[in-house]
Interface confidence: low
Amino acid sequence: YDFTNCDFEKIKAAYLSTISKDLITYMSGTKSTEFNNTVSCSNRPHCLTEIQSLTFNPTAGCASLAKEMFAMKTKAALAIWCPGYSETQINATQAMKKRRKRKVTTNKCLEQVSQLQGLWRRFNRPLLKQQ
Protein backbone atom coordinates (compact mmCIF):
# COMPACT_ATOMS: atom_id res chain seq x y z
CA TYR A 1 0.00 0.00 0.00
CA ASP A 2 1.21 3.52 -0.87
CA PHE A 3 0.73 5.76 2.18
CA THR A 4 1.45 8.99 0.28
CA ASN A 5 -2.18 10.18 0.24
CA CYS A 6 -2.99 9.61 3.91
CA ASP A 7 -4.19 12.49 6.09
CA PHE A 8 -1.05 12.61 8.20
CA GLU A 9 -2.29 15.23 10.66
CA LYS A 10 -5.36 13.14 11.51
CA ILE A 11 -3.19 10.06 12.00
CA LYS A 12 -0.84 12.09 14.17
CA ALA A 13 -3.83 13.20 16.28
CA ALA A 14 -4.90 9.56 16.69
CA TYR A 15 -1.38 8.65 17.78
CA LEU A 16 -1.16 11.48 20.31
CA SER A 17 -4.60 10.91 21.78
CA THR A 18 -4.66 7.13 22.14
CA ILE A 19 -2.10 4.98 20.30
CA SER A 20 0.89 6.46 22.16
CA LYS A 21 -0.73 5.69 25.52
CA ASP A 22 -1.51 2.12 24.48
CA LEU A 23 2.11 1.62 23.42
CA ILE A 24 3.28 2.93 26.79
CA THR A 25 0.86 0.58 28.57
CA TYR A 26 2.18 -2.37 26.59
CA MET A 27 5.76 -1.42 27.51
CA SER A 28 5.01 -0.74 31.19
CA GLY A 29 7.65 -2.21 33.44
CA THR A 30 10.29 -1.94 30.72
CA LYS A 31 13.11 0.61 30.96
CA SER A 32 13.12 3.08 28.09
CA THR A 33 16.84 2.41 27.54
CA GLU A 34 16.46 -1.39 27.45
CA PHE A 35 16.22 -1.62 23.65
CA ASN A 36 18.19 0.22 20.98
CA ASN A 37 16.23 1.61 18.05
CA THR A 38 17.46 -0.17 14.94
CA VAL A 39 14.55 0.70 12.62
CA SER A 40 14.10 4.22 11.29
CA CYS A 41 12.19 6.04 8.58
CA SER A 42 12.85 9.08 6.44
CA ASN A 43 9.42 10.62 5.81
CA ARG A 44 5.81 10.11 6.83
CA PRO A 45 4.76 7.61 4.12
CA HIS A 46 7.93 5.62 4.79
CA CYS A 47 7.23 5.71 8.56
CA LEU A 48 3.69 4.37 8.03
CA THR A 49 5.05 1.61 5.79
CA GLU A 50 7.45 0.53 8.54
CA ILE A 51 4.78 0.93 11.25
CA GLN A 52 2.36 -1.25 9.32
CA SER A 53 5.00 -3.89 8.75
CA LEU A 54 6.09 -4.08 12.40
CA THR A 55 2.53 -3.93 13.75
CA PHE A 56 0.77 -6.43 11.50
CA ASN A 57 3.39 -8.77 10.04
CA PRO A 58 4.28 -11.64 12.39
CA THR A 59 8.01 -12.00 13.00
CA ALA A 60 10.18 -14.69 14.51
CA GLY A 61 9.55 -14.63 18.23
CA CYS A 62 6.59 -12.26 18.08
CA ALA A 63 3.41 -13.34 16.33
CA SER A 64 0.78 -11.67 18.51
CA LEU A 65 0.89 -7.86 18.12
CA ALA A 66 -1.99 -7.51 15.67
CA LYS A 67 -4.61 -8.10 18.38
CA GLU A 68 -3.16 -5.60 20.84
CA MET A 69 -5.13 -2.43 21.54
CA PHE A 70 -2.52 -0.16 19.93
CA ALA A 71 -2.56 -2.32 16.79
CA MET A 72 -6.34 -2.23 16.46
CA LYS A 73 -6.34 1.55 16.88
CA THR A 74 -3.52 1.85 14.36
CA LYS A 75 -5.51 -0.22 11.90
CA ALA A 76 -8.60 1.93 12.49
CA ALA A 77 -6.64 5.16 11.94
CA LEU A 78 -5.10 3.88 8.71
CA ALA A 79 -8.47 2.61 7.49
CA ILE A 80 -10.14 5.96 8.12
CA TRP A 81 -7.39 8.34 7.01
CA CYS A 82 -5.64 6.44 4.22
CA PRO A 83 -7.85 6.17 1.09
CA GLY A 84 -8.23 2.57 -0.07
CA TYR A 85 -6.22 1.13 2.81
CA SER A 86 -9.00 -1.03 4.26
CA GLU A 87 -9.61 -2.75 0.93
CA THR A 88 -6.00 -3.86 0.74
CA GLN A 89 -6.17 -5.37 4.23
CA ILE A 90 -9.17 -7.70 3.87
CA ASN A 91 -7.15 -10.69 2.69
CA ALA A 92 -4.39 -10.05 5.21
CA THR A 93 -6.91 -9.88 8.07
CA GLN A 94 -8.57 -13.17 7.06
CA ALA A 95 -5.18 -14.86 6.92
CA MET A 96 -4.34 -13.48 10.34
CA LYS A 97 -7.50 -14.94 11.91
CA LYS A 98 -6.50 -18.42 10.79
CA ARG A 99 -3.08 -18.31 12.46
CA ARG A 100 -3.94 -16.45 15.66
CA LYS A 101 -2.06 -17.90 18.60
CA ARG A 102 -2.22 -17.62 22.37
CA LYS A 103 -1.33 -14.06 23.44
CA VAL A 104 2.15 -14.03 24.94
CA THR A 105 4.21 -10.91 25.66
CA THR A 106 7.70 -12.07 24.82
CA ASN A 107 10.90 -10.08 25.09
CA LYS A 108 11.00 -10.06 21.29
CA CYS A 109 7.54 -8.44 21.23
CA LEU A 110 8.67 -5.82 23.72
CA GLU A 111 11.66 -5.06 21.53
CA GLN A 112 9.41 -4.81 18.48
CA VAL A 113 7.02 -2.43 20.23
CA SER A 114 10.00 -0.33 21.34
CA GLN A 115 10.92 -0.04 17.65
CA LEU A 116 7.32 0.93 16.89
CA GLN A 117 7.48 3.72 19.46
CA GLY A 118 10.54 5.08 17.72
CA LEU A 119 8.87 4.94 14.32
CA TRP A 120 5.78 6.71 15.60
CA ARG A 121 7.94 9.41 17.17
CA ARG A 122 9.73 9.93 13.88
CA PHE A 123 6.37 10.04 12.06
CA ASN A 124 5.13 12.56 14.60
CA ARG A 125 7.93 15.02 13.90
CA PRO A 126 8.88 15.42 10.24
CA LEU A 127 12.51 16.36 9.87
CA LEU A 128 13.52 19.96 9.52
CA LYS A 129 14.78 20.96 6.11
CA GLN A 130 18.54 21.13 5.92
CA GLN A 131 19.63 24.69 5.24
Epitope: R122, R125, L128, Q130, Q131
Partner: antibody, heavy 121, light 105 residues
Framework: EVQLVQSGAEVKKPGASVKVSCKAS????????MNWVRQAPGQRLEWMGI????????SYNQKFKGRVTITRDTSASTAYMELSSLRSEDTAVYYC??????????????WGQGTTVTVSS | EIVLTQSPATLSLSPGERATLSCRAS?????MHWYQQKPGQAPRPLIY???NLASGIPARFSGSGSGTDYTLTISRLEPEDFAVYYC????????FGGGTKVEIK
Protein backbone atom coordinates in the same frame (compact mmCIF):
# COMPACT_ATOMS: atom_id res chain seq x y z
CA GLU B 1 17.86 10.48 33.64
CA VAL B 2 17.93 13.10 30.90
CA GLN B 3 20.74 15.61 31.39
CA LEU B 4 21.96 18.56 29.33
CA VAL B 5 25.33 19.90 30.44
CA GLN B 6 26.53 23.17 28.93
CA SER B 7 30.00 24.65 28.60
CA GLY B 8 31.27 27.31 30.98
CA ALA B 9 30.88 31.08 31.08
CA GLU B 10 32.51 33.18 28.37
CA VAL B 11 33.70 36.79 28.19
CA LYS B 12 34.04 38.17 24.66
CA LYS B 13 34.85 41.45 22.99
CA PRO B 14 32.42 43.14 20.58
CA GLY B 15 32.75 41.76 17.04
CA ALA B 16 34.03 38.37 18.26
CA SER B 17 32.23 35.00 18.10
CA VAL B 18 31.25 32.57 20.83
CA LYS B 19 30.52 28.85 20.59
CA VAL B 20 28.52 27.20 23.37
CA SER B 21 28.21 23.42 23.70
CA CYS B 22 25.45 21.27 25.16
CA LYS B 23 26.19 17.61 25.92
CA ALA B 24 23.13 15.37 26.14
CA SER B 25 22.84 12.11 28.07
CA UNK B 26 20.11 9.79 29.32
CA UNK B 27 18.24 9.50 26.01
CA UNK B 28 18.83 8.86 22.32
CA UNK B 29 20.30 12.15 21.10
CA UNK B 30 19.02 11.77 17.53
CA UNK B 31 15.40 11.19 18.61
CA UNK B 32 14.66 14.76 19.68
CA UNK B 33 15.12 18.32 18.55
CA MET B 34 17.44 20.70 20.42
CA ASN B 35 16.55 24.35 20.88
CA TRP B 36 18.71 27.28 21.88
CA VAL B 37 17.05 29.98 23.97
CA ARG B 38 18.66 33.05 25.49
CA GLN B 39 17.74 35.43 28.28
CA ALA B 40 19.28 38.87 28.65
CA PRO B 41 19.39 40.26 32.23
CA GLY B 42 15.85 40.96 33.39
CA GLN B 43 14.38 40.11 29.97
CA ARG B 44 12.04 37.50 28.54
CA LEU B 45 13.17 34.18 27.10
CA GLU B 46 14.08 34.50 23.43
CA TRP B 47 14.13 31.55 21.05
CA MET B 48 17.20 31.51 18.78
CA GLY B 49 16.92 28.34 16.73
CA ILE B 50 16.57 24.59 16.61
CA UNK B 51 18.38 21.57 15.19
CA UNK B 52 17.30 18.04 14.38
CA UNK B 53 20.32 15.96 15.46
CA UNK B 54 18.97 13.14 13.28
CA UNK B 55 19.88 14.89 10.03
CA UNK B 56 21.37 18.24 11.01
CA UNK B 57 18.38 20.22 9.73
CA UNK B 58 18.05 23.66 11.29
CA SER B 59 15.62 26.54 11.62
CA TYR B 60 16.52 29.97 13.00
CA ASN B 61 14.87 33.03 14.44
CA GLN B 62 15.19 35.60 11.66
CA LYS B 63 16.04 38.25 14.23
CA PHE B 64 19.59 36.94 14.29
CA LYS B 65 20.03 37.50 10.54
CA GLY B 66 22.58 34.80 9.90
CA ARG B 67 24.64 35.51 13.02
CA VAL B 68 23.66 32.22 14.67
CA THR B 69 24.75 28.75 13.54
CA ILE B 70 23.58 25.58 15.28
CA THR B 71 25.42 22.32 14.67
CA ARG B 72 25.70 18.91 16.28
CA ASP B 73 28.15 16.04 16.73
CA THR B 74 26.09 12.84 16.99
CA SER B 75 29.08 10.74 18.04
CA ALA B 76 29.51 13.00 21.07
CA SER B 77 25.76 13.58 21.63
CA THR B 78 26.54 17.29 21.67
CA ALA B 79 24.83 20.32 20.15
CA TYR B 80 26.58 23.62 19.54
CA MET B 81 25.41 27.20 19.13
CA GLU B 82 27.76 29.75 17.59
CA LEU B 83 26.90 33.45 17.62
CA SER B 84 29.06 35.82 15.60
CA SER B 85 29.53 39.60 15.37
CA LEU B 86 28.83 39.91 19.08
CA ARG B 87 27.56 43.17 20.54
CA SER B 88 26.88 44.31 24.08
CA GLU B 89 23.17 43.45 23.81
CA ASP B 90 24.13 39.80 23.26
CA THR B 91 25.14 39.63 26.93
CA ALA B 92 22.79 36.95 28.23
CA VAL B 93 22.40 33.47 29.63
CA TYR B 94 22.18 30.95 26.78
CA TYR B 95 20.23 27.72 27.29
CA CYS B 96 19.91 24.55 25.29
CA UNK B 97 16.55 22.85 25.68
CA UNK B 98 15.48 19.44 24.44
CA UNK B 99 12.17 19.47 22.62
CA UNK B 100 10.09 16.38 23.28
CA UNK B 101 7.79 14.72 20.78
CA UNK B 102 5.37 13.14 23.24
CA UNK B 103 3.36 16.32 23.68
CA UNK B 104 1.49 18.00 20.88
CA UNK B 105 3.25 21.27 20.24
CA UNK B 106 6.73 19.93 20.94
CA UNK B 107 7.45 21.26 24.41
CA UNK B 108 10.91 21.96 25.84
CA UNK B 109 10.97 19.39 28.62
CA UNK B 110 14.61 19.45 29.72
CA TRP B 111 16.94 22.44 29.90
CA GLY B 112 20.67 22.88 30.31
CA GLN B 113 21.98 24.82 33.29
CA GLY B 114 22.71 27.87 31.14
CA THR B 115 25.90 29.48 29.91
CA THR B 116 26.56 33.14 30.73
CA VAL B 117 28.08 35.07 27.83
CA THR B 118 29.32 38.57 28.60
CA VAL B 119 30.19 40.91 25.75
CA SER B 120 32.33 43.80 26.91
CA SER B 121 35.15 45.91 25.53
CA GLU C 1 5.60 35.89 14.15
CA ILE C 2 3.05 35.22 16.87
CA VAL C 3 3.43 37.63 19.80
CA LEU C 4 2.44 36.44 23.27
CA THR C 5 1.35 39.05 25.81
CA GLN C 6 1.19 38.04 29.45
CA SER C 7 -0.79 39.86 32.11
CA PRO C 8 -0.42 41.09 34.66
CA ALA C 9 3.32 41.75 34.56
CA THR C 10 3.41 41.39 38.35
CA LEU C 11 0.97 39.65 40.66
CA SER C 12 1.26 40.37 44.40
CA LEU C 13 -0.44 37.69 46.46
CA SER C 14 -0.18 35.92 49.81
CA PRO C 15 0.43 32.21 50.36
CA GLY C 16 -2.87 30.30 50.20
CA GLU C 17 -4.42 32.68 47.69
CA ARG C 18 -5.44 31.78 44.14
CA ALA C 19 -3.32 33.04 41.24
CA THR C 20 -4.69 33.52 37.73
CA LEU C 21 -2.17 34.30 34.98
CA SER C 22 -3.19 35.24 31.45
CA CYS C 23 -1.45 34.76 28.12
CA ARG C 24 -2.90 36.28 24.95
CA ALA C 25 -1.63 35.40 21.46
CA SER C 26 -1.64 37.88 18.56
CA UNK C 27 -3.29 35.18 16.44
CA UNK C 28 -4.89 31.84 17.17
CA UNK C 29 -2.67 28.98 18.37
CA UNK C 30 -3.53 25.34 19.01
CA UNK C 31 -2.08 25.06 22.50
CA MET C 32 0.13 26.76 25.04
CA HIS C 33 2.98 25.57 27.24
CA TRP C 34 3.83 27.12 30.61
CA TYR C 35 7.19 27.30 32.40
CA GLN C 36 8.26 28.43 35.86
CA GLN C 37 11.58 30.18 36.42
CA LYS C 38 13.25 31.10 39.68
CA PRO C 39 16.22 33.49 39.97
CA GLY C 40 19.46 31.95 38.74
CA GLN C 41 17.73 28.81 37.48
CA ALA C 42 16.73 27.44 34.09
CA PRO C 43 13.01 27.39 33.24
CA ARG C 44 11.06 24.37 34.45
CA PRO C 45 8.12 22.95 32.47
CA LEU C 46 4.79 23.18 34.28
CA ILE C 47 2.01 22.63 31.75
CA TYR C 48 2.26 21.00 28.33
CA UNK C 49 -0.22 21.55 25.52
CA UNK C 50 -2.56 23.88 27.41
CA UNK C 51 -3.69 21.57 30.22
CA ASN C 52 -1.31 18.61 30.75
CA LEU C 53 0.71 18.68 33.96
CA ALA C 54 4.42 18.07 33.51
CA SER C 55 6.06 15.31 35.50
CA GLY C 56 6.36 16.07 39.20
CA ILE C 57 4.16 19.18 39.09
CA PRO C 58 1.55 19.33 41.87
CA ALA C 59 -2.15 19.33 41.06
CA ARG C 60 -2.65 22.88 42.36
CA PHE C 61 -1.35 24.00 38.94
CA SER C 62 -3.78 23.85 36.04
CA GLY C 63 -4.02 25.27 32.54
CA SER C 64 -6.88 26.08 30.22
CA GLY C 65 -7.78 28.10 27.17
CA SER C 66 -8.07 27.99 23.40
CA GLY C 67 -7.62 30.20 20.35
CA THR C 68 -5.88 33.36 21.51
CA ASP C 69 -6.59 33.28 25.26
CA TYR C 70 -4.90 30.94 27.71
CA THR C 71 -4.78 30.82 31.50
CA LEU C 72 -2.50 29.29 34.12
CA THR C 73 -4.13 28.89 37.54
CA ILE C 74 -2.48 28.11 40.87
CA SER C 75 -5.32 27.15 43.20
CA ARG C 76 -3.50 27.80 46.49
CA LEU C 77 -0.12 29.48 46.43
CA GLU C 78 2.65 27.74 48.33
CA PRO C 79 5.85 29.57 49.34
CA GLU C 80 7.81 27.79 46.60
CA ASP C 81 5.42 29.03 43.89
CA PHE C 82 6.65 32.62 43.98
CA ALA C 83 8.56 32.91 40.71
CA VAL C 84 8.26 34.14 37.12
CA TYR C 85 5.93 32.25 34.77
CA TYR C 86 6.27 32.17 30.98
CA CYS C 87 3.88 30.95 28.32
CA UNK C 88 5.25 29.55 25.05
CA UNK C 89 3.72 28.53 21.75
CA UNK C 90 4.98 26.53 18.80
CA UNK C 91 4.40 27.61 15.23
CA UNK C 92 7.05 28.05 12.54
CA UNK C 93 8.97 29.86 15.29
CA UNK C 94 8.75 29.22 18.99
CA UNK C 95 7.92 32.36 20.97
CA PHE C 96 7.64 33.15 24.67
CA GLY C 97 5.52 35.63 26.53
CA GLY C 98 7.07 38.46 28.53
CA GLY C 99 6.45 36.66 31.81
CA THR C 100 4.36 37.23 34.92
CA LYS C 101 6.16 37.64 38.22
CA VAL C 102 4.22 36.20 41.15
CA GLU C 103 5.56 37.90 44.28
CA ILE C 104 4.73 37.75 47.96
CA LYS C 105 2.37 40.50 49.04
Amino acid sequence: EVQLVQSGAEVKKPGASVKVSCKASGYTFTDDYMNWVRQAPGQRLEWMGIISPYNGGTSYNQKFKGRVTITRDTSASTAYMELSSLRSEDTAVYYCAREDYDYDGYAMDHWGQGTTVTVSS
Amino acid sequence: EIVLTQSPATLSLSPGERATLSCRASSSVSYMHWYQQKPGQAPRPLIYATSNLASGIPARFSGSGSGTDYTLTISRLEPEDFAVYYCQQWSSNRTFGGGTKVEIK
